[in-house]
C-alpha cells in the first residue's frame, strides 16, 4: 500500500505559538521515494502564497522521511501569520496545507496564550 | 496485514462516562501521517466522526460533542482511547475506530468491527 | 457543518447492470492546497465500512476497477460499470476537507 508520491505532513489547521526575540525552525516533513524534490516557504497573504525568497533555509534528514527547514533568527512580530511549503516533482507542484505562526510580542505579552485559546482563534480563522 | 478492533462497556447508565479502547496492528501510531479516529453509528442510521489522534498526539474532535469528548493513545502498546462523558441514550450505537491514512491529509482506509453501546436506565 | 447529500435514497439494480449514486455538499471540497478530500465507503450488511475511494478518484487497495468516482468542488458521482452480489449494501460519501469530518446520510444498494 506504500506509494512514492511526494507527502507534505503539515497537518490541516495545525500552528505554532511563539514568541518574537526566540530562534525558531519551521518544519516541513517530507516522504519521497527517489529523489528528492525541490521545496520551498511561502507566506500567506490573503489567497496568494508569497514565496520566501533569500531566507536561511536547510534539509534534516531522518530515518525514512526528510524535513525542509524554515529558520527563524531571530522571530519578529512581523512573522506573524500563515505559511505554506510546497514540493516540485516530477514537473507537478504538491502543496501542503497552511500552518500557522502565532507571534507573541513580549514587550506587549504578559502571558502566552492557552492551548484553548490558540484552538479558538484557529477555528475562527478556519470556519 | 492492517486489524482494528474496538472494545467498551456494552451497557452503560445515563450519566455514565463511557470508555472505549481501540487496539490496533500492522501500523505504528509513532509513523507520519498515520492517525486514528473515532466514529459512530446510531442502529439503522448513518456516521458520525467523533474524533482524531495524529501521530504526533494533535487531535481534533466534533465541536458539536467536544466538551464531552477526549481521546488519547499509547502508542507503545498500539492502543488509542476515546472517553464521552455523561452519556444519554442518544449515545447509544455502533463505535467503530478506524485508521487514518495519509494522502495530503486523512482518509479512513481500514474500520474496526465495531463495538455495540446501549445506555439505558 | 458541511452537509453532504446523497441520491437516490435506495438503488435497486440487476446484477450486469450499472449504477450510479451522487453525492452534493453544501461547500466546495476543493482545498487550498488543490486537493478534494472527497472519499466513498460501502457498508455491506452487518459489517463494518470498507474504503472504496478517496481524493474523487483513486480506489483504495483491493478495489475493483469497476468501481470509479468522479466530480469537482459541490458535485461527486461514484459509478459502478456493472453491478455484482458483492456489492450491495450501503454507499456512504463523506468529506475530509473540513472540520468536523461529515458523512453522507447513505444511498442503499439493492440487487434486483
Known amino acids: 500500500k506504500e506509494s512514492c508520491d511526494v507527502q507534505l505532513y503539515i497537518k490541516r489547521q495545525s500552528y505554532h505559538s511563539i514568541f518574537a526575540g526566540d530562534p525558531f525552525k519551521l518544519e516541513c516533513p517530507v516522504k519521497y521515494c527517489a529523489h528528492r524534490p525541490q521545496v520551498t516557504w511561502c507566506k500567506l497573504n490573503g489567497t496568494t502564497c508569497v514565496k520566501l525568497e533569500g531566507r536561511h533555509t536547510s534539509w534534516k534528514q531522518e530515518k525514512n522521511l526528510s524535513f525542509f527547514i524554515l529558520h527563524f533568527e531571530p522571530v519578529l512580530p512581523s512573522d506573524n501569520g500563515s505559511y505554506r511549503c510546497s514540493a516540485n516533482f516530477l514537473s507537478a507542484i504538491i502543496e501542503s496545507h497552511s500552518t500557522t505562526l502565532y507571534v507573541t510580542d513580549v514587550k506587549s505579552a504578559s502571558e502566552r496564550p492557552s492551548k484553548d485559546e490558540m484552538a479558538s482563534r484557529l477555528w475562527l480563522l478556519y470556519s | 496485514q492492517v486489524t482494528l478492533k474496538e472494545s467498551g462497556p456494552g451497557i452503560l447508565q445515563p450519566s455514565q462516562t463511557l470508555s472505549l479502547t481501540c487496539s490496533f496492528s500492522?501500523?505504528?501510531?509513532?509513523?507520519?501521517?498515520?492517525?486514528v479516529s473515532w466514529i459512530r453509528q446510531p442502529s439503522g442510521k448513518g456516521l458520525e466522526w467523533l474524533a482524531h489522534?495524529?501521530?504526533?498526539?494533535?487531535?481534533r474532535f466534533n465541536p458539536s460533542l467536544k466538551s464531552r469528548l477526549s481521546i488519547s493513545k499509547d502508542t507503545s502498546n498500539n492502543q488509542v482511547f476515546l472517553k464521552i462523558t455523561t452519556v444519554d441514550t442518544a449515545d447509544t450505537a455502533t463505535y467503530y475506530c478506524?485508521?487514518?491514512?495519509?494522502?495530503?491529509?486523512?482518509?479512513?482506509?481500514?474500520w474496526g468491527q465495531g463495538t455495540t453501546l446501549t445506555v439505558s436506565s | 457543518d458541511v452537509v453532504m447529500t446523497q441520491s437516490p435514497l435506495t438503488l435497486s439494480v440487476t446484477i450486469g447492470q450499472p449504477a450510479s449514486i451522487s453525492c452534493k455538499s453544501t461547500?466546495?471540497?476543493?482545498?487550498?492546497?488543490?486537493?478534494?478530500?472527497l472519499n466513498w465507503l460501502l457498508q455491506r450488511p452487518g459489517q463494518s465500512p470498507k474504503s472504496l475511494i478517496y481524493?474523487?478518484?483513486k480506489l483504495d487497495s483491493g478495489v475493483p476497477d469497476r468501481f470509479t468516482g468522479s466530480g469537482s468542488g459541490t458535485d461527486f458521482t461514484l459509478k459502478i460499470s456493472r453491478v455484482e452480489a458483492e456489492d450491495l449494501g450501503v454507499y456512504y460519501c463523506?468529506?475530509?476537507?473540513?472540520?468536523?469530518?461529515?458523512f453522507g446520510g447513505g444511498t442503499k444498494l439493492e440487487i434486483k
Open positions: 481524493l474523487v478518484s
Open positions: 489522534i495524529y501521530w504526533d498526539d494533535d487531535k
Open positions: 463523506w468529506q475530509g476537507t473540513h472540520f468536523p469530518w461529515t
Open positions: 500492522g501500523f505504528s501510531l509513532s509513523t507520519f501521517g498515520m492517525g
Open positions: 461547500q466546495s471540497l476543493l482545498d487550498s492546497d488543490g486537493k478534494t478530500y
Open positions: 478506524a485508521r487514518g491514512n495519509w494522502d495530503g491529509e486523512t482518509y479512513f482506509d481500514y
